[in-house]
């Protein structure tokens, strides 16, 4: 009566777990009052008609990680109390019509990680109480209209990791309660206008890792509750001006790994909960005024690995909370002196791997809290007098791999660096490129007697995009910092210190934050 099959373990008869390769069919007899049955890691290849007929009280049934490839239509007959059914991680290619008929209480159906090639409206037409449907990791190529029409209570639908090439605009139209829709890792090339219009309660939409090229202007206009929107690793080349205008709840937005060439002013509507915006690995060439002005709470902006050659002076207007700005690996040659003026809370800025030839003296004027500045691998020959003097929290400055011109004009910078060596790190130090007689020598310890009067040597190299030094531009990238023990460089070794700018003792050597976005 309460018998437990020898291949299984039964806890108080109501909980049954059957595991092991020796099991090749559903064990019998199963306790009549079983409420939970798990059949895991067996060699069962098929489910016959009504193997669970005598356990009608079953609430949860997990048949996972088996060799299951065939199921008879009546396999789940008489399981009217079943709330949770998982057939995940099996080898199912086809689902018989009517398989889920009579499962009136079913709330969660997991069919993920099988080999399903199609689903039909008739498969789920009886599952009116279903709240969660997991179909990810199958071989679905299309979803027919009506497939989900009866699942009006569905809150979570995962169709990720399939082979979907297109989606009908009507397929989700009756899913007004849906909160999570995952379509990641498919082959979608476009999303028709209206596809998500009925999803008024949607909070998460995952579209990453598809081949989407264009987004319809009003694609998300009905999704005011959207909080997470994943669009990364697609082929999106442009963003319609109003695409993000009505998403006030958004707190995660990924757009990296696309083909975006430009961002129009105000493209990002008010998103008070958005803390990070990742736009790396696109083809952006310029940043106009006010492009991010609505993102008042943004703390991290990643624009690295684009082709940005121009930044308008007001591009970063409104980013009063920004702490980290990554612009590394772009095509910047010049920066306006006011471009960072509004970024009062900025702590980390990454400008490495660009083509910067000079910096305005006031470039960091308003950014008093800067802690890290990455300027390596540019085309800087010198820096303006006092450019870093007011940066009392600066603890990491990277200047190597620039063609420093070590004539007498370099002395103010050389002397500042001499007093601030710990900020440079000990991994790679800046070295002179010209004149030829001091090329390769450390800028910090250059013998000033050798330094010639200010003569511009026409030997400015054009560093290739991929240079000889180790690539540190991958994101998230964090420049490794060696110990900040001060280098031993006795002042008396230097013959001319008359132009030293004596800076205040900032006692920042113990500071630890060293991120470079």
């Amino acid at each position: 009566y309460y018998g437990c099959p020898s291949e299984c373990t039964c806890s108080r008869a109501s909980q049954v777990e059957c595991t092991g390769a020796r099991i090749v069919a559903v064990p019998t007899p199963l306790p009549w009052n079983a409420m939970s049955l798990q059949i895991l890691n067996t060699h069962i290849t098929e489910l016959s008609e009504s193997p669970f007929l005598n356990i009608s009280a079953l609430i949860a049934l997990r048949i996972e990680k088996n060799e299951l490839s065939h199921i008879m239509p009546g396999a789940f007959r008489n399981l009217g109390s079943l709330r949770y059914l998982s057939l995940a991680n099996n080898k199912l290619q086809v689902l018989p019509i009517g398989l889920f008929q009579g499962l009136d209480s079913l709330e969660s159906l997991l069919l993920s990680s099988n080999q399903l090639v199609q689903i039909q409206p008739a498969h789920f037409s009886q599952c009116s109480n279903l709240k969660e449907l997991q179909l990810h990791g199958n071989h679905l190529e299309y979803i027919p209209d009506g497939a989900f029409d009866h699942l009006v209570g569905l809150t979570k639908l995962n169709l990720g990791k399939n082979s979907l090439t297109h989606i009908s605009p009507r397929v989700f139209q009756h899913l007004g309660n849906l909160q999570v829709l995952r379509l990641y890792e498919n082959r979608l090339t476009d999303i028709p206008m209206g596809t998500f219009d009925g999803l008024v309660n949607l909070q998460e939409l995952a579209l990453q890792q598809n081949q989407i090229g264009l987004l319809s202007p009003g694609l998300f206009h009905n999704n005011h509750n959207l909080q997470r929107l994943y669009l990364s690793n697609n082929h999106i080349s442009q963003l319609p001006p109003s695409i993000f205008m009505q998403l006030p709840q958004l707190n995660r937005l990924t757009l990296f790994g696309n083909s975006l060439k430009e961002l129009s002013p105000g493209i990002f509507g008010p998103m008070p909960n958005l803390r990070e915006l990742w736009l790396y690995d696109n083809h952006i060439t310029s940043l106009p005024d006010n492009v991010f002005s609505n993102l008042r709470q943004l703390q991290v902006l990643i624009l690295s690995r684009n082709q940005i050659s121009f930044i308008s002076p007001g591009a970063f207007n409104g980013l009063t909370e920004l702490r980290e700005l990554s612009l590394h690996t772009n095509a910047l040659q010049d920066l306006d002196g006011n471009v960072f003026r509004m970024l009062a809370n900025l702590q980390n800025i990454s400008l490495q791997n660009n083509r910067l030839r000079q910096l305005p003296g006031n470039i960091f004027a308003n950014v008093n809290g800067l802690m890290t500045i990455q300027l390596q691998n540019n085309q800087l020959e010198n820096l303006p007098l006092g450019i870093f003097d007011h940066l009392g929290k600066l603890c990491e400055l990277r200047l190597y791999d620039n063609p420093w011109r070590c004539d007498s004009d370099i002395l103010p910078l050389r002397n500042w660096l001499l007093l601030n060596q710990p900020r440079l790190g000990t991994d790679t130090v800046p070295v002179c490129f010209s004149p030829a007689n001091v090329r390769g020598q450390s800028l910090i310890i250059i013998n000033v007697n050798v330094a010639v009067p200010s003569v511009h040597v026409p030997e400015v190299p054009s560093y290739p995009e991929t240079s000889w030094y180790p690539d540190t531009s991958s994101y998230p990238d964090t420049t490794s910092i060696s110990s900040t023990t001060e280098l031993t460089s006795p002042v008396e070794d230097y013959t001319d210190l008359t132009t030293i700018q004596v800076t205040d003792d900032r006692s920042v050597w113990g500071m630890t934050q060293a991120q470079s976005g």
Partner: antibody, heavy 122, light 107 residues
């Protein structure tokens, strides 16, 4: 193996300051968000702060905002919590944890340290 | 701030029992909810993420369900090592609040 080890907990008087550290090992620290959670004696868990993988983004619970500062040093695989203006109600075990999330629905504090005790008392 | 409430606050059960713990959110949090187990003097341990996904290495007797505002953690057959306190936590928005906990002890 993957682990987090907190240190720096101590007895401190009200109004005082303390700096907690969390040393990470066994995983690529710079790839993960990190977080601090505390638990007052006999009470439940309280999330207090987290920090983005590069250190740029931070967030705080209202109960500690303006008094606590979270930071990290990816080169040293270390997370920090600088606590100032400490109050008796800050007395708790402080845990650091790895905040693992991805765009496929994973969200969880999957690795925790053993905790370090902070006592604020006169 | 999203407030999570758990019920019951404590329960007594026997080895082999099926245990159900509920967590309710003050507003919809989609499926951005995790469940943790904590034993006295130890750090919490992640059991369930995304409301229903089992964390790697966690026994299959644990399961989670729900979305929106109502969530459930189920222990299909209580084992001696399962006596502990269980917490839910939401990741939908900051601050990432925890529920007050449910203590499961021996009957």
């Amino acid at each position: 193996q993957v682990q987090l080890v907190e240190s720096g907990g101590d007895l401190v008087t009200p109004g005082g300051s303390l700096r907690l550290s969390c040393a990470a090992s066994g995983f690529t620290f710079s790839d993960y968000y990190m977080t601090w959670i505390r638990q007052a004696p006999g009470k439940g868990l309280e999330w207090i702060s987290d920090i983005g993988s590069s250190g740029g983004s931070v967030d705080y619970a209202d109960s500690v905002k303006g008094r606590f500062t979270i930071s990290r040093d990816n080169a040293k695989n270390s997370l920090y919590l600088q606590m100032s203006s400490l109050r008796a109600e800050d007395t708790a075990v402080y845990y650091c944890a790895r905040y693992n999330w991805n765009d496929r629905g994973y969200d969880g504090f999957d690795i925790w340290g053993q905790g370090t005790m902070v006592t604020v008392s006169s | 701030e999203i407030v999570l409430t758990q019920s019951p606050s404590s329960l007594s059960a026997s080895v082999g029992d099926r245990v159900t713990i509920k967590c309710r959110a003050s507003q919809g949090i989609s499926s951005a909810l995790a469940w943790y187990q904590q034993k006295p003097g130890k750090a919490p341990k992640l059991l369930i993420y995304d409301a229903s996904s089992l964390e790697s290495g966690v026994p299959s007797g644990f399961s989670g369900s729900g979305s929106g505002t109502d969530f459930t953690l189920t222990i299909s057959s209580l084992q001696p090592e399962d006596f502990a306190t269980y917490y839910c936590q939401q990741f939908n928005s900051y601050p990432h609040t925890f529920g007050p906990g449910t203590k499961v002890d021996i009957k």
